[in-house]
Structure formats: structure tokens, C-alpha cells
């Protein structure tokens, strides 16, 4: 009788060990899935290169809060600048606040000095309204100083600490913006 009880106890213990092993495997699998999910989300937000180096912004990009910025080293017209940004998974800079404007102009002073940089702002030919590239309106303090008398399409650019306007077909540097990779901590 005692032997029978002892055998049952051993069987139960064996079962328990197997269950613990299964639980351990499941926990490991679940953790792996969670990690993969986080990686996928990160991958969709940014290109593979920045996901690999796990920093919020790719190399040669500047971070401020939730955004990464790239200051170009080449000149191009406004439309080509937009295409160049898209190739990097970004769009032309969209300035949402005075704080962001101050950060950009401060960074430009450190990097290159007083040059012209296209941003994602253009003037609608029919209404004359200024709109960011996603269709939203700039806040009142972020409207370009009327400087362009061009009959052609007019786009916005940053110079020193001002937002100005110019014929979109002129050549300037440009600034791209993308969302910073969210840390998974």
C-alpha cells in the first residue's frame, strides 16, 4: 500500500515537473512574441537600420522630443526635397510650435549658419491659404513673412530664425522629419 502511494506521489511529481517545464516554455514563447511585436511596431515606424541600432533616430539625424530631423547637405527644389525625404521614410519638416521652431533654428545655427531650408509648407494657388503638407493650417505665429511676389507656386522655408516664402522651383537645402522610435522600456 505504501509503495503504491509512493509511486503515485512520484508520478504526480513527474507531472508537476512537466507542467513547470511547459509553463516555462510558454512564458519564454510569450516573451519572444511580445518582443517580436515590439520589434514589428518599431520596424513599421522607422526603417530597418534605425531599428537595428535601437537609438530613437537614425545616424546623422537630430532628436527633439518625439521627432527626428535630418538637415540636408544638398540643394533641391521643393518637390524634389519632398521626394528625397520620402525615400528616407520621412516628410519635409512640419513645425507645430514655437518651441519646435526655436529648436530647429538653434540647431541650424550650430550646424550650418544662415542658409535657406525648405520646410513642408506651401501656399494654395486658389485660396492663398498656407497649409502644411498634411493639410493642416499653421498656427498664427508660424505664418511665413510675405516675401515672394512669384506668379509660380510658393513654398515655405526657414532662414536664421524666420519662416519665409519663395518660388517652389528655387534651389535650397531642406529639412526632413520623422517620428522618433519609441523606446520599449
Amino acid at each position: 500500500k505504501l509503495l503504491q502511494v509512493s509511486t503515485i506521489a512520484m508520478q504526480q511529481q513527474e507531472k508537476l515537473i512537466q507542467q513547470e517545464r511547459a509553463l516555462l516554455n510558454f512564458t519564454e514563447w510569450k516573451r519572444s512574441c511580445a518582443l517580436q511585436m515590439k520589434y514589428c511596431q518599431a520596424f513599421m515606424q522607422n526603417s530597418l537600420s534605425s531599428a537595428h541600432n535601437s537609438s530613437p533616430c537614425p545616424n546623422n539625424w537630430i532628436q527633439n522630443r518625439e521627432s527626428c530631423y535630418y538637415v540636408s547637405e544638398i540643394w533641391s527644389i521643393w518637390h524634389t526635397s519632398q521626394e528625397n525625404c520620402l525615400k528616407e521614410g520621412s516628410t519635409l519638416l512640419q513645425i507645430e510650435s514655437k518651441e519646435e521652431m526655436d529648436f530647429i533654428t538653434g540647431s541650424l545655427r550650430k550646424i550650418k549658419g544662415s542658409y535657406d531650408y525648405w520646410v513642408g509648407l506651401s501656399q494654395d494657388g486658389h485660396s492663398g491659404r498656407w497649409l502644411w503638407q498634411d493639410g493642416s493650417s499653421p498656427s498664427p505665429g508660424l505664418l511665413p513673412a510675405e516675401r515672394s511676389q512669384s506668379a509660380n507656386q510658393v513654398c515655405g522655408y526657414v532662414k536664421s530664425n524666420s519662416l519665409l516664402s519663395s518660388n517652389c522651383s528655387t534651389w535650397k537645402y531642406f529639412i526632413c522629419e520623422k517620428y522618433a522610435l519609441r523606446s520599449s522600456v
Epitope: 526603417s47 528616407e88 516628410t91 520623422k178 517620428y179
Partner: nanobody
């Protein structure tokens, strides 16, 4: 290599709506953004709308407030919802995939808006 297949074009009356789709296959991991283009003056293709992997969007002035670009990552598909269509929106719409090294184009889908 990336392959793009557009669909959803057709004939619609002014003020009507259409939804274009562009499905990407092949080396989709290299794609950083996708967009829709149409021929403009001099037959050069102008960017109508684009969306990045992070969800940032851009539109040409003439479609702002009427067109909306979106993406379904699970289906590797980008959509262009076109509302309040005008006769001047008539064109062949081409899907484009942006990668760091190369751009890929679809065959195009015809959109005709009658007045």
C-alpha cells in the same frame, strides 16, 4: 525588387468618390514610404499623396481636404480615398514605392471624372 498592383479606378461623376488600392509584394522590407502620382504639365508625374511607414502624410495642394491616403500594414496595401472629385482629377494614377536606393512604380489605374 518590389511589385505594385493598383486597382479601384473607373468612371465617376463630378462630386463622386473612388477608392484606389495599391498592393505591394516582393522585398517590402525595403519600402520606407508609398505614394500616388499622376501626370501633370509636360507629362511629368506629380506627387498627389504619400504616406511614410511611420504614418506621416503629404498631399499636393489641389487635393488637400478631398483626398485621404492610408495604409493597411497587414495587407501591405496603401489606399487613396478620393472624395468630391473634379473633372481636373481625371488622370492615370500611379502607385510608387520609395526605398532608399530605388523607386518602384505600378502600371497605373485610370480615373475619369465626367462633368
Amino acid at each position: 525588387q518590389v511589385q505594385l498592383q493598383e486597382s479601384g479606378g473607373g468612371l465617376v461623376q463630378a462630386g463622386g468618390s473612388l477608392r484606389l488600392s495599391c498592393a505591394a509584394t516582393g522585398d517590402i522590407s525595403s519600402i520606407n514610404a508609398m505614394g500616388w502620382h499622376r501626370p501633370a504639365r509636360g507629362n511629368e508625374r506629380e506627387l498627389v499623396a504619400a504616406i511614410t511607414n511611420g504614418g506621416r502624410t503629404t498631399y499636393v495642394d489641389s487635393v488637400k481636404g478631398r483626398f485621404t491616403i492610408s495604409r493597411d500594414n497587414a495587407k501591405n496595401t496603401v489606399y487613396l480615398q478620393m472624395n468630391s472629385l473634379k473633372p481636373e482629377d481625371t488622370a492615370v494614377y500611379f502607385c510608387k514605392a520609395y526605398t532608399r536606393d530605388e523607386d518602384y512604380w505600378g502600371q497605373g489605374t485610370q480615373v475619369t471624372v465626367s462633368s
